[in-house]
């Protein structure tokens, strides 16, 4: 959840008082301060309820509590997306919505929340504590996923208020990258402020060799670094059997949208809900958890009017031998 910190206004030092370190001490604290003020741990909430009108129909609502912009939402059934569940719907702010049975109606409720109705006819309804998961890919927080289920004792038409995730998983950039950088930044900022307070103002001493202020860079872990670090998380009893404790390993972010430009908001939206852009397989991309995805492999040939979410549907989440990514 985003937290706002009250920070006293800092008076910029008088011009000419800063020496060789002037540029850095002026720019860096402000960059770090901005990060510290706007920083907070994003959260994903999931609400599952059974409709009173149609007893076998479920409504899943998910929301993202964070300050970043959402680039993709994936809803899955049976477990986390990319780690045991099957995709029910994929919602993209511009390319539209794609859904698979038994999803009946997926839609955006707000800019940061979605809802999904699961059909009740034709198949048996999922058992009361079936797992439903929502994964939000956002910039700059990374990918955050939460899972929820309908409590077995729930009355039709009733549901618990949306609660923060029974499981809250951030892919490594979210946890280690942003949090680590911010923690370090905030500590460093305090250190700078303390030093600035206790140190007499240096004389003006221009130097041609003064280092430039370091540029802020997006932290983008490679898939190799992700693979090396596992983030275990536990599920509550969300299966139709006795509770089991599962350890899952984070996968790269959803690289189906890899061909999106850096600033997707400026991309003109076509009339079709899904653009006819070929999207390569997960394995052919290096996932960058800040919501921007860099292509590592060759762009596949355009194969038709439908959106090619990945050229090799038998393609893996990890390489699967000769049938893996081409």
């Amino acid at each position: 959840m985003r937290t706002e910190a009250q920070v006293p206004a800092l008076q910029p030092p008088e011009p000419g008082l800063e020496g060789a370190m002037g540029h850095r001490t002026l720019v860096l604290p402000w960059v770090l301060l901005t990060l510290c003020v706007t920083a907070g741990t994003p959260e994903v909430w999931v609400q599952v309820r059974m409709e009173a009108t149609e007893l076998s129909s479920f409504t899943i609502r998910c929301g993202f509590l964070g300050s970043g912009s959402i680039s993709l939402v994936t809803v899955s059934w049976g477990g986390p997306n990319g780690a045991g569940g099957t995709t029910l719907a994929v919602l993209h702010p511009e390319r539209g919505i794609r859904q698979w049975a038994p999803a009946r109606q997926a839609r955006w409720e707000t800019q940061s929340s979605i809802s999904l109705i699961l059909e009740g006819s034709g198949a048996s309804s999922p058992c009361a504590n079936t797992t439903f998961c929502c994964k939000f890919a956002s910039f700059p927080e990374g990918s955050w996923e939460a899972c929820g289920s309908l409590p077995p004792s729930s009355d039709p038409g009733l549901s618990a208020p949306p609660t923060p995730a029974p499981i809250l998983r951030a892919d490594l950039a979210g946890i280690l990258g942003v949090s680590g950088v911010l923690l370090f930044g905030c500590v460093y900022l305090l250190h700078l402020l303390r030093r600035h307070k206790h140190r007499p103002a240096p004389r003006l001493q221009p130097s041609r060799t003064s280092p430039q202020a370091p540029r802020a860079r997006a932290w983008a872990p490679s898939q190799a670094s992700q693979a090396a670090l596992h983030v275990p998380y536990a599920t509550i009893n969300t299966s139709c059997r006795p509770a089991t404790l599962d350890t899952a390993h984070p996968h790269g972010g959803p690289s189906w949208w890899a061909s999106l430009p850096t600033h997707a908001a400026h991309r003109p939206q076509g009339p079709a809900a899904w653009a006819s852009t070929p999207i390569p397989a997960r394995g052919s991309f290096v996932s960058v958890e800040n919501g921007l995805y860099a292509q590592a492999g060759e762009r596949p040939p355009h194969t038709g009017p439908g959106l090619t979410l990945f050229p090799d549907p038998r393609g893996p989440r990890a390489m699967e031998g000769p049938l893996g990514v081409r």
Epitope: W77, G78, G79, P80, G82, A83, G84, G85, T86, T87, R98, Q99, W100, A101, P102, R104, E119, G122, A123, P126, C127, T130, T131, T235, T238, S239, C240, R241, T244, D246, A248, A281, R282, T303, G304, P305, G306, L307, T308, L309, F310, D312, P313, R314, G315, P316, R317, A318, E320, G321
Partner: antibody, heavy 118, light 106 residues
């Protein structure tokens, strides 16, 4: 490479149950859901249901509810389907099929022939 | 449930000939999937999302359609294409398949 190895053919008497298996290899077993599909001369291909290996959650075609029960054993990377109270109508080839990265029957087992005969 | 009707049920084609088969849905579906099954073999994914070729599928195969009407085309028939072709929808549970179109080589 990804392989789904199913158990051998079964010849059973009417009224009894049979449990067939599908062992996955070449991929991380809990990461993908499994489907079961029936193929008979009379009805072509029929979808029986889906099971999440990860959570054990299931969803059945209403037609097969009470007839088929899907389970998994993660430790042996095996999915099972038990067919109860067998009749001649249940004589068919049963396939397990794994999804790809999005829903579709990307990989299929070789099939298990179940023959119900008195 | 959504009923998928395939036609023709059986057809023959000479090598090099263009082959087209259709699949009509009882209600609108978003995408169609096509599978090829040869005798004594399991079905094999051929086309997904209406028009996209699965891995290893020759480019002579193509799919098209929308709403309730879909088709699969073999640009130039080859002997190895003799098989039964099934369409399948993923828009509504229960998932359903067509009865199949059997393609024989003349």
């Amino acid at each position: 490479q990804v392989q789904l190895q199913q158990s051998g053919p079964e010849v059973v008497r009417p009224g009894v149950s049979v449990k067939i298996s599908c062992k996955g290899s070449g991929y991380k077993f809990p990461d993908y859901v499994m489907h079961w599909v029936k193929q008979s001369h009379a009805k072509s291909l029929e979808w029986i249901g889906i099971i999440s290996i990860y959570s054990g959650n299931t969803n059945y075609n209403q037609k097969f509810k009470g007839k088929a029960t899907m389970t998994v054993d993660k430790s042996s990377s095996t999915a099972y389907m038990e067919l109860a109270r067998l009749t001649s109508e249940d004589s068919a080839i049963y396939y397990c099929a794994r999804e790809g990265d999005l829903p579709m029957f990307a990989y299929w087992g070789q099939g298990t022939l179940v023959t119900v005969s008195a | 449930q959504i009923v998928l009707t395939q036609s023709p049920a059986i057809m023959s084609a000479s090598p090099g000939e263009k082959v087209t088969m259709t699949c009509n849905a009882s209600s609108s579906v978003s995408y169609m999937y096509w599978y090829q099954q040869k005798p004594i073999s399991s079905p094999r994914l051929l086309i997904y999302d209406t028009s996209n070729l699965a891995s290893g599928v020759p480019v002579r195969f193509s799919g098209s359609g929308s709403g309730t009407s879909y088709s699969l085309t073999i640009g130039r028939m080859e002997a190895e294409d003799a098989a039964t072709y099934y369409c399948q929808q993923w828009s509504s549970y229960p998932l359903t398949f067509g009865a199949g179109t059997k393609v024989e080589v003349k």
